[in-house]
């Protein structure tokens, strides 16, 4: 059934080429190569992909042909290692090529860079883009795959094919429209924002698998799928979890052809077994493959079955708890998580996992006690504070968001997080705090029953961005501790951090607060980022500054930018008024 139906194949590359078709094969190989060699020029990657594709075709024609029996890692790794400038461009990554599989692939994976030193993608004029699209549609779309893949080395490859399909559709439609820009730009903005979100969500899945292991990922998947498919039986959910784990393990491991193939099989299985999974899948299952897989991944939670019995009966009141636990610990805990999650679509996945962990810890202790039943009888009472903590936090933060609006809410978080972990780089603090702040507009509009799963699971994704960026250049023991101790307790760990009293304030540098006329031509978003960067630097200089002091300085700063951007001689205004602002700010903050 499902994802594991295939027999062994003489040639893996031929098998995948036939399963996926030439177009998807080429696209996935390009993504794989761009995610490994993130600095290589587009033309070099296209050349490598064409060579691999030609080779795959020879294997399709004759599976016994030379080298066709080699593993995909061997074939792709050998191809990547032919790049002439590997040592100059990638330094020690070139040492990977001296290794044998599977160590070589592991080595390439370890060198993936979450924050590659690449120029920001600048969007050309609409007419320029449309001309490029019409001149060579294939190259235009390949370039999109390449640019996204190299900047997001863990992007979920089959989903990137779906984004590329939408990207193509946008250009096909809008380049013929009367007002090309009005048609195209909102679509591109939507794709960009959805793409960033998709990349971040997948990055958390890969971090979960790579840093915390398969068991952690499976627990997450049991909880999420049980919320989504509450009518499905436990065995069905367990089967879906196993197949989904295989798909994500493959994609996170760089096995993109196998991943895309298995994801298609999983979608097929789910649609063939809708009746025993969910009543919400009908529309998804009528769509073409890429849309179908995406739709299933985003499908709304099915209605909970009526009259589900109390959880306490099987998991607390029963005298058989320890016996059932001893019979198969992980299965029993899996059933607990399934039963709890399907009854609680109003809880975040991470909360459900905290409850399951608490339950497991209690059973480990109590099942070795003299009177196990008496020992675990009150286990559900231990859940109450765990449930209330995120509920209260979300309530407080949504109130703050509604009072301040997104920009000022982000600023409040910038100050809060800079005080917690001032050693973290300013760009990372700005990026992460801005994203944390978006939780307000994303989740606070929801009714109570949807707020927690929206907010806390989103925060897990954002804090993972902080964790992966920090891992590249670790500067704070507190960040390392919160990121590595427990996947499900990352958010509570960061929430519990107080001001870092050990931090030695940064030396004042006037250059940091010197602004020029170019700020006036920036978009509103870019201008906000400039101001927020200054705010972080202010807090790093004066961690003990009060909210009132910081607000006064930021208000002055906003007025200064507005005034100089209206001035005739902008540059002179920025130079003269800027000096005054710096002096006034230093005085206001006692610097």
């Amino acid at each position: 059934r499902g994802v594991f139906r295939r027999d062994a194949h003489k040639s893996e590359v031929a098998h995948r080429f036939k399963d996926l078709g030439e177009e998807n094969f080429k696209a996935l190989v390009l993504i794989a190569f761009a995610q490994y060699l993130q600095q290589c020029p587009f033309e070099d990657h296209v050349k490598l992909v064409n060579e691999v594709t030609e080779f795959a075709k020879t294997c399709v024609a004759d599976e016994s042909a030379e080298n066709c029996d080699k593993s995909l890692h061997t074939l792709f790794g050998d191809k990547l290692c032919t790049v002439a400038t590997l040592r100059e461009t990638y330094g020690e990554m070139a040492d990977c090529c001296a290794k044998q599989e599977p160590e070589r692939n592991e080595c390439f994976l370890q060198h993936k860079d979450d924050n590659p030193n690449l120029p920001r993608l600048v969007r050309p004029e609409v007419d320029v883009m449309c001309t490029a699209f019409h001149d060579n549609e294939e190259t235009f779309l390949k370039k999109y795959l390449y640019e996204i893949a190299r900047r997001h080395p863990y992007f979920y490859a089959p989903e990137l094919l779906f984004f590329a399909k939408r990207y193509k559709a946008a250009f096909t439609e809008c380049c013929q429209a009367a007002d090309k820009a009005a048609c195209l730009l909102p679509k591109l903005d939507e794709l960009r924002d959805e793409g960033k979100a998709s990349s971040a969500k997948q990055r958390l899945k890969c971090a979960s698998l790579q840093k915390f292991g398969e068991r952690a990922f499976k627990a997450w998947a049991v909880a999420r799928l049980s919320q989504r498919f509450p009518k499905a039986e436990f065995a069905e959910v367990s089967k879906l979890v196993t197949d989904l784990t295989k798909v994500h393990t493959e994609c996170c491991h760089g096995d993109l052809l196998e991943c895309a193939d298995d994801r298609a099989d999983l979608a097929k299985y789910i649609c063939e077994n809708q009746d025993s999974i969910s009543s919400k899948l009908k529309e998804c299952c009528e769509k073409p493959l890429l849309e179908k897989s995406h739709c299933i991944a985003e499908v709304e939670n099915d209605e909970m079955p009526a009259d589900l019995p109390s959880l306490a009966a099987d998991f607390v009141e029963s005298k058989d708890v320890c016996k059932n636990y001893a019979e198969a610990k992980d299965v029993f805990l899996g059933m607990f998580l399934y039963e709890y999650a399907r009854r609680h679509p109003d809880y975040s996945v991470v909360l459900l996992l905290r409850l399951a962990k608490t339950y497991e810890t209690t059973l480990e202790k109590c099942c070795a006690a003299a009177d196990p039943h008496e020992c675990y009888a009150k286990v559900f009472d231990e859940f109450k504070p765990l449930v209330e903590e995120p509920q209260n936090l979300i309530k407080q933060n949504c109130e703050l968001f509604e009072q301040l609006g997104e920009y000022k809410f982000q600023n409040a978080l910038l100050v809060r997080y800079t005080k917690k972990v001032p050693q973290v780089s300013t760009p990372t603090l700005v990026e992460v705090s801005r994203n944390l702040g978006k939780v307000g507009s994303k989740c606070c509009k929801h009714p109570e029953a949807k707020r927690m799963p929206c907010a806390e699971d989103y925060l897990s994704v954002v804090l993972n961005q902080l964790c992966v960026l920090h891992e590249k250049t670790p500067v704070s023991d507190r960040v390392t501790k919160c990121c590595t101790e427990s996947l499900v307790n990352r958010r509570p760990c960061f929430s519990a951090l107080e001001v870092d009293e050990t931090y030695v304030p940064k030396e004042f540098n006037a250059e940091t607060f010197t602004f020029h006329a170019d700020i006036c031509t920036l978009s509103e978003k870019e201008r906000q980022i400039k101001k927020q960067t200054a705010l972080v630097e202010l807090v790093k200089h004066k961690p003990k500054a009060t909210k009132e002091q910081l607000k006064a300085v930021m208000d002055d700063f906003a007025a200064f930018v507005e005034k100089c951007c209206k001035a005739d001689d902008k540059e002179t205004c920025f130079a003269e008024e800027g000096k005054k602002l710096v002096a006034a700010s230093q005085a206001a903050l006692g610097l």
Epitope: A235, S238, A328, D330, V331
Partner: antibody, heavy 119, light 111 residues
């Protein structure tokens, strides 16, 4: 130190009854399932039955349901396997095992009891 | 008739690697990695060498490793030694309220 000590070898005639034992020590006997495994000479291992000494709940492999009885006395940390009427085909080595975390994982084993049934 | 299928015998020379397969694992056992491997010398009790598909009990050599793909588990022994010659059996969880199942056993011969 965890130990499972089984009773000695038995030679019996067809139709006779028999009860062999497995005494556990060095751990909380009531908190782990105990399983009995059969090995006919020259053949593989077979799970016969399991018991949870905490409440004496039992499970039997379909092939052995009604052929053997598993029991336990938690007061003396001992599990038993018994036959009411032995057959020549019951000739085998019988092992008991402590099952840890899941009933397919025997982490400690008895030394084995050889049962020979012959007329 | 075993619910799990293993090859009756495998052989290898000292220093080589061998792999023994065990197919027919139930979906639930596969989902929760509930597969164990045992080594047994003639006249001796079985010894647990792998549990939960890939984990080794303390004291077991790291030359023994386990893996799983679909409904088939595998035991790999690398750097084969003469004293690896023994019978190897897999066992898997068979579902709630059920007794576990064994494979038929595989006799490993070191040439």
């Amino acid at each position: 130190e965890v130990q499972l000590v089984q009773s000695g070898a038995e030679v019996k005639k067809p139709g006779e009854s028999l009860k062999i034992s497995c005494k556990g020590s060095g751990y909380s006997f009531t908190n782990y399932w105990i399983g009995w495994v059969r090995q006919v000479p020259g053949r593989g291992l077979e799970w016969l039955a399991i018991i949870y000494p905490g409440d004496s709940d039992t499970r039997y492999s379909p092939s052995f349901e009604g052929q053997v009885t598993i029991s336990a006395d938690k007061s003396i940390s001992t599990a038993y396997l018994q036959w009411s009427s032995l057959k020549a085909s019951d000739t085998a080595m019988y092992y008991c095992a402590r099952l840890h975390g899941v009933v397919s994982r025997g982490d400690y084993w008895g030394q084995g009891t050889l049962v020979t049934v012959s007329s | 008739q075993s619910a799990l299928t293993q090859p009756a015998s495998v052989s290898g020379s000292p220093g080589q690697s061998i792999t023994i397969s065990c197919s027919g694992i139930s979906s639930l056992a596969g989902s929760y990695n509930l597969v164990s491997w045992y080594q047994q010398y003639p006249g001796k009790a079985p010894k647990l060498i792998i549990y939960e598909v890939t984990k080794r009990p303390s004291g077991v050599s790291n030359r023994f490793s386990g893996s799983k793909s679909g409904n088939t588990a595998s035991l790999t022994i690398s750097g084969l030694q003469a004293d690896d010659e023994a019978e190897y059996s897999c066992s898997s969880y068979a579902g709630r309220n059920a007794v576990a199942v064994f494979g038929g056993g595989t006799q490993l011969t070191v040439l």
